[in-house]
Each structure stands twice: as structure tokens, then as C-alpha cells.
């Protein structure tokens, strides 16, 4: 079973486009687009601060932090409405995720 | 980074026994933990897991047999009725993609009259 | 649900010989597959995962092949030390499952 070019191999991502933009009050904005080829019970996620395929039961049930999606040594919390989640770093840094 | 798990024991036949798995070196916030059976000169056996909102995914065949519960610190297995068959050693392991990279040492369950 | 069918149970080889051993999926894994080798008294330990990626520290001469239903895991040069039994173990959907385990005697 080969892969055709372009082709993903399956339950994994690539990411597609990276945008960085509008730095305002010392926060930078991130928008970022993957591509995924997930297995049956898949959707794409996060897991440790890149695209990856996750339970699609967590995506239904808005846990994020069930992915997760922050790297090893971060603490991970649920936005209020379940929004999204922050991941904060061990000396306090906070970096927050909104899902749209 | 390591597990251990503690709390194996020889019990009677319907005696509820709980294992503890305690890890050192990293946060069970940041994991899958699963727990893992094997009994004497078998094979492995996938109980269950648990996600760090405490969400479960049981085998089928250990589901109202068995509960996995957590704290910050510690994951939890209740062999709720145990049986001669649940004779075994019990392993916790912890996993980010499904594969189990990193082992507790095990501990032994011997149900017997 | 997946049922992981690994041969030989159990096998016998010599030292600086290969071993192959193999684990049959009933449903396409997608690569989803990972090898354990495990010594009496002991947990097991993590060889490879993905089917081929070997983990930090294993040596060289255990490889990992296969894709769909068809999954391989090589010793090539075996040693002394790699007598042990030997699971796969597939991660493509709940429930976890492993192959039953094959035995490896060195002479």
C-alpha cells in the first residue's frame, strides 16, 4: 500500500498554512490551518502544541483538554463556555486556543 | 519518569480491591493512563483507560467489572465483584497516541477462598 | 472488534541468526501498530511504534514492517539479551488489543 503524492498517511496531519499577525498590547494572533487523514472515530485536534487526529468524541463534548493539546510540563484549562483552553507554561506564560 | 502501582493483594472471591498508580516525574494531567492485566504465563489485556477530564473507555468484557477513577496524583483501579479469573498482575501505563510508553512495574491480585 | 493474530507462539533461534515474527490484523490498523518485548518478572518494554519507528534507546537490529492488515517485527543479529516473549499490540480504535505473544528462546 503506497502513498500517492500529496496523499496523507492515515491519523496524521500536516499543517497548510501558518498565519501570524496584528501584535497588539504584546500578544501575537496565530491562525493556523491543517490537513488530516484521520481514522474512523478521528477528527482533527491538537495534541502537544501540533495538528493531530483525536477522539471525535472530545471535539463533541468540548473537552479540550482531552486532546492534549499543550506540551509536556503545561497545565491545561478549559476557556470559559468551553471556547477553547490555555496552556500555561511552568514560569506562568499563558497561551490561549479559541476554536472556530 | 516512572509509574508504581500499589495495592495488590490476596483476596476472597467478591471482595472489592482498589489499585493505586502513582506517578513520579510527570503529571497524569498531561496523559491517556491506562491500566493492563496479565495473568500468570499469559497474555496482555487492555482493561481501560482514563482522560484527564476523567472521561472512560472500557474493554468490553471489563466493563461493570472494573472502574478507573483519578485524582491530581494518582489513577485508580476497582475490581468491583473479583472473580479466580481476575488472578493477575496489573500494570498502569501511560500513553499520548495510543502506544503504552511508559510501564509501572506491576502489582499482583490473587482472588482465592 | 480488532483481534491481533501473532506466529509463531514461540520460536527458537541462535545467536547472530534473524527472527521474524508477524501479527495479522482482522481489519485494516493503518499503521497503528506497536511491539513490546517483555522479560519475566518485568513489565514490557516499548519497542517500536508506528510499525517502524523504533524508540529511543532500542538497538539497531529490531526493525518494524508491514501496513493494512500485514505487520512484521525483524530481529536481525540476534543477541543473548533479546531472549524474551515478544507482543504487538494495535492502537487504531478502541479497545486496545494485543496479539497473544511470542516466545523467543536463544541457543
Known amino acids: 500500500q503506497f502513498l500517492k503524492e500529496g496523499q496523507l498517511a492515515a491519523g496524521t496531519c500536516e499543517i497548510v498554512t501558518l498565519d501570524r499577525c496584528c501584535n497588539k498590547n504584546r500578544r501575537t494572533i496565530a491562525r493556523q490551518t491543517a490537513r488530516c487523514a484521520c481514522r474512523k472515530g478521528q477528527i482533527a485536534g491538537t495534541t502537544r502544541a501540533r495538528p493531530a487526529c483525536v477522539d471525535a468524541r472530545i471535539i463533541k463534548t468540548k473537552q479540550w483538554c482531552d486532546m492534549l493539546p499543550c506540551l509536556e510540563g503545561e497545565g491545561c484549562d478549559l476557556l470559559i463556555n468551553r471556547s477553547g483552553w490555555t496552556c500555561t507554561q511552568p514560569g506562568g506564560r499563558i497561551k490561549t486556543t479559541t476554536v472556530s | 519518569q516512572s509509574l508504581e502501582e500499589s495495592g495488590g493483594r490476596l483476596v476472597t472471591p467478591g471482595t472489592p480491591l482498589t489499585l493505586t498508580c502513582t506517578a513520579s516525574?510527570?503529571?497524569?494531567?498531561?496523559?491517556?493512563m491506562n491500566w493492563v492485566r496479565q495473568a500468570p504465563g499469559k497474555g496482555l489485556e487492555w482493561i481501560g483507560i482514563?482522560?484527564?477530564?476523567?472521561t472512560t473507555y472500557y474493554a468490553g468484557w471489563a466493563k461493570g467489572r472494573f472502574t478507573i477513577s483519578k485524582t491530581s496524583t494518582t489513577v485508580d483501579l476497582k475490581i468491583t465483584s473479583p472473580t479466580s479469573e481476575d488472578t493477575a498482575t496489573y500494570f498502569c501505563?501511560?500513553?499520548?497516541?495510543?502506544?503504552?510508553?511508559?510501564w509501572g512495574p506491576g502489582t499482583l491480585v490473587t482472588v482465592s477462598l | 472488534e480488532l483481534d491481533l493474530t501473532q506466529t509463531p507462539p514461540s520460536l527458537s533461534a541462535s545467536v547472530g541468526g534473524t527472527v521474524t515474527i508477524n501479527c495479522l490484523a482482522s481489519?485494516?490498523?493503518?499503521?497503528?501498530l506497536a511491539w513490546y518485548q517483555q522479560k519475566p518478572g518485568k513489565p514490557p518494554t516499548l519497542l517500536i511504534s508506528?510499525?517502524?519507528n523504533l524508540e529511543s534507546g532500542v538497538p539497531p537490529r529490531f526493525s518494524g514492517s508491514g501496513s493494512g492488515t500485514d505487520y512484521t517485527l525483524t530481529i536481525g543479529g540476534v543477541q543473548a539479551e533479546d531472549a524474551a516473549t515478544y507482543f504487538c499490540?494495535?492502537?487504531?480504535?478502541?479497545?486496545?488489543?494485543f496479539g497473544a505473544g511470542t516466545n523467543v528462546e536463544i541457543k
Open positions: 501505563a501511560r500513553t499520548v497516541s495510543g502506544y503504552f510508553d511508559i
Open positions: 516525574g510527570f503529571s497524569l494531567s498531561s496523559y491517556y
Open positions: 482514563i482522560y484527564p477530564s476523567g
Open positions: 481489519e485494516d490498523i493503518y499503521s497503528a
Open positions: 508506528g510499525t517502524s
Open positions: 499490540q494495535g492502537y487504531s480504535s478502541y479497545p486496545l488489543t
